[in-house]
């Protein structure tokens, strides 16, 4: 069974309007975790919660609160209470198989369906997750590069499946 | 009566919900009308009309159509079409007190409460705008001098000559 | 909109304002000094265009303050040269909003001319 | 220039008080009005004339076009007892009336 997946819920139908209600041109920073792109789900999960919880909030600064409707504020809003969950269910199973990675997270600037696509993807990655011995995978190999291996993509940040 | 009151819709509901789900540091760019910030509205705003026009259409490009509620998609288009249609009556009034200035207008940076504040404004002065045969006040004049006016000196004037 | 700067000077000396805006496009907006003398109404002193390319002034001070600003310090200026008794007064700057006339005015700042 | 009157009056809370002003030449709806309690910079309160600037309460509205402006406020609040000024801006020199002192009766 999945770590934290009672945390949580199914906000697909909520990001897509959210994503749809952003100028697409729009920058949102994040401290994009090395190897998130590379590396299975368990080497950077615990780590990208805790960059995504901060980023959420910072957007969530940059709107009003209005009570009308689905807002993004009112989305945004949501979004931060489901990751500031799971931050806090990394924390109680911080003794579990969940890596922190050794390199320092970069802030980065995402559009709006970038960063969103890694927050569906953090998401899917709780509601998948299972405790595993292995460990030795949360190593990025020296000789891993854009030729040895097809995954990693020299002109994007990640390689993500569209926001659902 | 005002010159294309007709035209103009109540849209400041609409309008006061959509700045609230606009990030507060988007820039938008809006081609700022020589002469706006120091000569009085009648002298720029018919031009600024078609500056909003563009403006808007570029920021309706900015987001997604869904079809869910009044999203941002829906509340620019609306916002696009009395645009349009006050561009369509400044034509049709072009012969009345307009003025058009020579000088091209410049690419500047908005916040949205900005955007919107001018906006609101520039539609507020249509909703008020009476024909007048006075032109002067649409042109600072080097001729303009403690002589002439001893209350004032200027230097540096813009030169933004009255259109027949 | 913090207007600094401000204080005592003898009759023909020289002071400069600073007034530091924030929370909007400042280089949109002309920008305005508007000076009050003890007890008395409001006067325009003097105004500059959002780029800085046009300046105007009253005649009373004409030829002796500047206005001028620094858009990538979003601050104003007024430079006061040959100070008189006269020009004793709360200095403001004001924002001249595009359709709003001064809709935006700082806390002002005291200059006293005496000997 | 611009002529305000009167230059003072004195009023009770809940009067409806109207200040005026003049303008030497027309100045189309190009008058604004503005508030100023002793210290404080002068606030706006309407601008063109008649509209109301954001946060301003209701009962402050403005009226008239060309060269005769009125302000009235419908019913006097104790925070409204300041001097009122009313300015042009259609061209510089920009110009404002002598002020109008609202005190208490």
């Known amino acids: 069974e999945g770590i934290c997946r009672n945390r949580v819920t199914n906000n697909v139908k909520d990001v897509t309007k959210l994503v749809a209600n952003l100028p697409k041109d729009y920058m949102i920073t994040l401290k994009y975790v090395p190897g998130m792109d590379v590396l299975p789900s368990h080497c950077w999960i615990s780590e990208m919660v805790v960059q995504l919880s901060d980023s959420l909030t910072d957007l969530l600064d940059k709107f009003s609160n209005i009570s009308e409707g689905l807002s993004n504020y009112s989305i945004i809003d949501k979004l931060v209470n489901i990751v500031d969950d799971l931050v806090e269910c990394v924390k109680e199973n911080s003794s579990k198989d969940l890596k922190k990675s050794f390199k320092s997270p970069e802030p980065r600037l995402f559009t709006p369906e970038e960063f969103f696509r890694i927050f569906n993807r953090s998401i899917d990655a709780f509601k998948d997750f299972v405790v595993a011995s292995e460990t030795s995978d949360c190593v990025v190999s020296s000789t891993l590069s854009p030729e040895k291996d097809s995954r990693v993509s020299v002109t994007k940040p990640f390689m993500l499946p569209p926001v659902a | 009566e005002g010159i294309c009151r007709n035209r103009v819709t109540n849209n400041v509901k609409d309008v006061t919900k959509l700045v609230a789900n606009l990030p507060k540091d988007y820039m938008i760019t809006l081609k700022y009308v020589p002469g706006m910030d120091v000569l009085p509205s009648h002298c720029w705003i018919s031009e600024m009309v078609v500056q909003l026009s563009d403006s808007l259409t570029d920021l309706l490009d900015k987001f997604s159509n869904i079809s869910e509620g009044l999203s941002n998609y829906s509340i620019i288009d609306k916002l696009v079409n009395i645009v349009d249609d006050l561009v369509e009556c400044v034509k049709e009034n072009s012969s009345k007190d307009l003025k058009k200035s020579f000088k091209s207008p410049e690419p500047r940076l908005f916040t949205p409460e900005e955007f919107f504040r001018i906006f609101n404004r520039s539609i507020d002065a249509f909703k008020d705008f009476v024909v007048a045969s006075e032109t002067s006040d649409c042109v600072v004049s080097s001729t303009l001098s403690p002589e002439k006016d001893s209350r004032v000196s200027v230097t540096k004037p813009f030169m933004l000559p009255p259109v027949a | 909109l913090v207007e600094s700067g401000g204080g005592l000077v003898q009759p023909g000396g020289s002071l400069r304002l600073s007034c530091a805006a924030s929370?909007?496009?400042?280089?949109?907006?002309?920008m305005s000094w508007v000076r009050q003398a003890p007890g008395k109404g409001l006067e325009w002193v003097s105004a500059?265009?959002?780029?800085?390319?046009?300046?105007y002034y009253a005649d009373s001070v004409k030829g002796r303050f500047t206005i001028s600003r620094d858009n990538s310090k979003n601050t104003l200026y007024l430079q006061m040269n040959s100070l008189r008794a006269e020009d004793t007064a709360v200095y403001y700057c004001?924002?001249?909003?595009?359709?709003?006339?001064?809709?935006?005015w700082g806390q002002g700042t005291l200059v006293t001319v005496s000997s | 220039q611009m002529t305000q009157s009167p230059s003072s009056l004195s009023a009770s809370v809940g009067d409806r008080v109207t200040i005026t002003c003049r303008a030497s030449q027309g100045i189309r709806g190009y008058l604004g009005w503005y508030q100023q309690k002793p210290g404080k910079a002068p606030k706006l309160l309407i601008y063109?004339?008649?509209s109301l600037q954001s946060g301003v309460p209701s009962r402050f509205s403005g009226s008239g076009s060309g060269t005769d402006f009125t302000l009235t406020i419908s019913s006097l609040q104790p925070e409204d007892f300041a001097t009122y000024y009313c300015?042009?801006?259609?061209?510089?020199?920009?110009?404002f009336g002598q002020g109008t002192k609202v005190e208490i009766k």
């Open positions: 004001a924002r001249r909003d595009f359709f709003a006339h001064f809709d935006v």
């Open positions: 500059i265009s959002g780029s800085g390319g046009s300046t």
């Open positions: 300015a042009e801006y259609i061209r510089m020199p920009y110009t």
């Open positions: 063109s004339a008649s």
């Open positions: 929370g909007f496009t400042f280089s949109s907006y002309a």
